[in-house]
Amino acid sequence: AILGRSETQECLFFNANWEKDRTNQTGVEPCYGDKDKRRHCFATWKNISGSIEIVKQGCWLDDINCYDRTDCVEKKDSPEVYFCCCEGNMCNEKFSYFPEMEVTQPTSNPVTPKP
């Protein structure tokens, strides 16, 4: 059973390492894949002394942990590299960090990407 599934056909693309990887730095990435597989968008970033540095954004292969996520939100507490994935076109355009501890109340740190 799949409720309210949104198709992902394209994602915001960004690569901080674009020169070395020989890719574009930014743009829109069409998401390709097998017909029977779902596609997602993702974002990875770092927080260097309070400054947000985007590492990569783009398409992400079929991954059950991305199912039913309409927003790109990292919820892990204090990761080295922040990661989020989501379903829906360009859903990785905005991403945010809402750490959730097991017991304590979640706090929020919304992020506006500035590639």
Partner: antibody
Framework: EVQLLESGGGLVQPGGSLRLSCAAS????????MAWVRQAPGKGLEWVSG????????FYTDSVKGRFTVSRDNSRNTLYLQMNSLRAEDTAVYYC???????????WGQGTLVTVSS | QTVVTQEPSFSVSPGGTVTLTCGFN?????????PSWYQQTPGQAPRTLIY???TRSSGVPDRFSGSILGNKAALTITGAQADDESDYYC??????????FGGGTKLTVLG
Amino acid sequence: EVQLLESGGGLVQPGGSLRLSCAASGFTFRNYAMAWVRQAPGKGLEWVSGISVTGGSTFYTDSVKGRFTVSRDNSRNTLYLQMNSLRAEDTAVYYCAKVYYTSFFDYWGQGTLVTVSS
Amino acid sequence: QTVVTQEPSFSVSPGGTVTLTCGFNSGSVSTSYYPSWYQQTPGQAPRTLIYNTNTRSSGVPDRFSGSILGNKAALTITGAQADDESDYYCVLWMGSGIWVFGGGTKLTVLG
């Protein structure tokens, strides 16, 4: 420390029902997909069911479709497997597993034994 | 119906190297199937060894490595030890909510 503790197994007659539970601790349960995997006596591992973070998407192996229902209660950090119309071939140890990004099983419970016999 | 195939059994001498493989009937295994490998000793829950083709799980010794060999996923154990004697399972993520386990390989460490 991540812990997954299954319960609810036991002896049941063919055609009967059981509900398995998996109590999760040591991680933020609502952030991860979960799965059930079983192992019949002397046999290999078999994926049974999976469920997305919200519970909005559920998946089953063909042999249990229409008989088993997976669900989760994110407020109670608990995964469930409702098993109806049980058959002898459902006899197995049932493991719950946490699923990490790239869809692999990163932590496993110790399992609970379900025996279907008259 | 997807069937994932593994060698039913394999033997290795202590200190030797063994490569277990994982293929399927519908074509080639690629990294997009996120192959993962699990070790299980009798009466115990499985232990995660390798995920995403070649990433070792936390605490797994570097004697264990994963790769794609030709059209199959592979688990290589170098410098095999007595306590590597176990069952090894590969899993392929087929996407759209479906996983398929291989039948498992029973590894015997001789001697």
